[in-house]
């Protein structure tokens, strides 16, 4: 499995003469899995023009991708610890199977691709370990996870295209409002 | 290239309500992990962080001026306001608005109006 | 609250001579602390963010170091142009708070 950044991987900030928290362990982790989506999306923007597509909402509609909305708890508004935590796990077991897809659907990216999904798979387990209350946390089911990629990978290429653009595109939203929010735990 | 303009009155009277205007371009409130934030300085002294505005309309303000302070946005406008209610001459002061955030959603301002000043006197 | 306290508060300083002006934190920030410069009558300029990293289109003589409470920005060979007032940010919790402010005046 992949290591933390800060550890013994490539570190997104400085090197650091202390040990990190917890916290700032997974904020770092965090960034990690953000520069990977971003070299994702360079590729996906230089191969097609769907970073600049007007027909977003079109694709969108037959995607159910996680989102935050000020009742998950997580806005400063209304924040509770809790509630934001099984959000942000909820959130990010949904978005596994939309990594899934991802693999396979690059060429220059392929390793980068799976160190996302691993690296998210690894930021999963230490949320898991952070969460008081994990009853709450709803793990997708496996069956239906198997025909939505049946379902995706159906598709046509410019759908694949767009689909594969509207995931990085919301899984990177979904990590940043992630950060912020772990950021006050 | 990333500019800010403060707008707003550069004088007001004491109880008045401050309205202050941020306009920007360069960068877009749409864009995830980007935000819009407010700082203000009182002559020959240092900065002092007031409230901040997320992509997604999440607020964050200064404790100590909470009650006092509301941020919005208008994302078409390219413009963040400012308001604070009963002002006194203590916040006679420079404010700033800043660009913040990025990719890791930053706790830093990378790029600053040219400041507005604002005195609080009758 | 994280209180950020700075020394010195007043430097005065010969052109191509080393300027350290130093930050500590309350308590500890990891890496999350941000410098930014300010000249007389202009606004804050970013100068290094996450206590080292450099920051596009700011010159080379700018670096900073640290990490936990302790933090050092160094100007090497300070320019006529570096006088300012130097800032150090906590960007790890909040509220963002500021330091007390270095002015670096050139002799």
């Known amino acids: 499995a992949p290591v933390l950044p800060g550890e013994d991987s490539k570190n997104v900030a400085a090197p650091h003469s202390q040990p990190l928290t917890s916290s700032e362990r997974i904020d770092k982790h965090i960034r990690y899995i953000l520069d990977g989506i971003s070299a994702l999306r360079k590729e996906t923007c230089n191969r097609s023009n769907m970073c600049e597509s007007s027909k977003e909402a079109l694709a969108e509609n037959n995607l159910n991708l996680p989102k935050m909305a000020e009742k998950d708890g997580c806005f400063q508004s209304g924040f509770n610890e809790d509630t934001c935590l099984v959000k942000i796990i909820t959130g990010l077991l949904e978005f596994e199977v939309y990594l899934e897809y991802l693999q396979n659907r690059f060429e220059s990216s392929e390793e980068q691709a799976r160190a996302v999904q691993m690296s998210t798979k690894v930021l999963i387990q230490f949320l898991q370990k952070k969460a008081k209350n994990l009853d709450a946390i709803t793990t997708p089911e496996p069956t239906t996870n198997a025909s939505l990629l049946t379902k995706l990978q159906a598709q046509n290429q410019w759908l694949q295209d767009m689909t594969t653009h509207l995931i990085l595109r919301s899984f990177k939203e979904f990590l940043q409002s992630n950060l912020r929010a772990l950021r006050q735990m | 290239q990333v500019t800010l303009k403060e707008s707003g009155p550069a004088l007001v009277k004491p109880t008045q309500t401050l309205t202050l205007t941020c306009t920007f371009s360069?960068?877009?409130?749409?864009?995830?992990?980007?935000?819009v934030g407010w700082i203000r300085q009182p002559p020959g002294k240092a900065l002092e962080w007031l409230a901040h505005i997320w992509w997604d309309d999440d607020k964050r303000y200064n404790s100590a001026l909470k009650s006092r302070l509301t941020i919005s946005k208008d994302t078409s406008k390219n413009q963040v306001v400012l308001t604070m209610t009963n002002m006194d001459p203590v916040d006679t002061a420079t404010y700033y608005c800043?660009?913040?955030?990025?990719?890791?959603?930053?706790?830093?301002?990378?790029?600053w109006g040219q400041g507005t000043l604002v005195t609080v006197s009758s | 609250e994280i209180v950020l306290t700075q020394s010195p508060d007043f430097q005065s300083v010969t052109p191509k001579e080393k300027v350290t002006i130093t930050c500590r934190a309350s308590q500890s920030i990891s890496d999350y602390l941000h410098w930014y410069q300010q000249k007389p009558d202009q606004s804050p300029k970013l100068l290094i963010k996450y206590a080292s990293q450099s920051i596009s289109g700011v010159p080379s003589r700018f670096s900073g170091s640290g990490s936990g409470t302790d933090f050092t920005l160094t100007i090497n060979s300070l320019e006529a142009e570096d006088a300012a007032t130097y800032y150090c940010?906590?960007?790890?919790?909040?509220?963002?708070?500021f330091g007390q402010g270095t002015k670096v005046e050139i002799k």
């Open positions: 800043a660009r913040i955030g990025g990719l890791y959603v930053d706790y830093l301002m990378d790029y």
């Open positions: 940010q906590n960007g790890h919790s909040f509220p963002w708070t």
């Open positions: 360069g960068f877009s409130l749409s864009t995830s992990g980007m935000g």
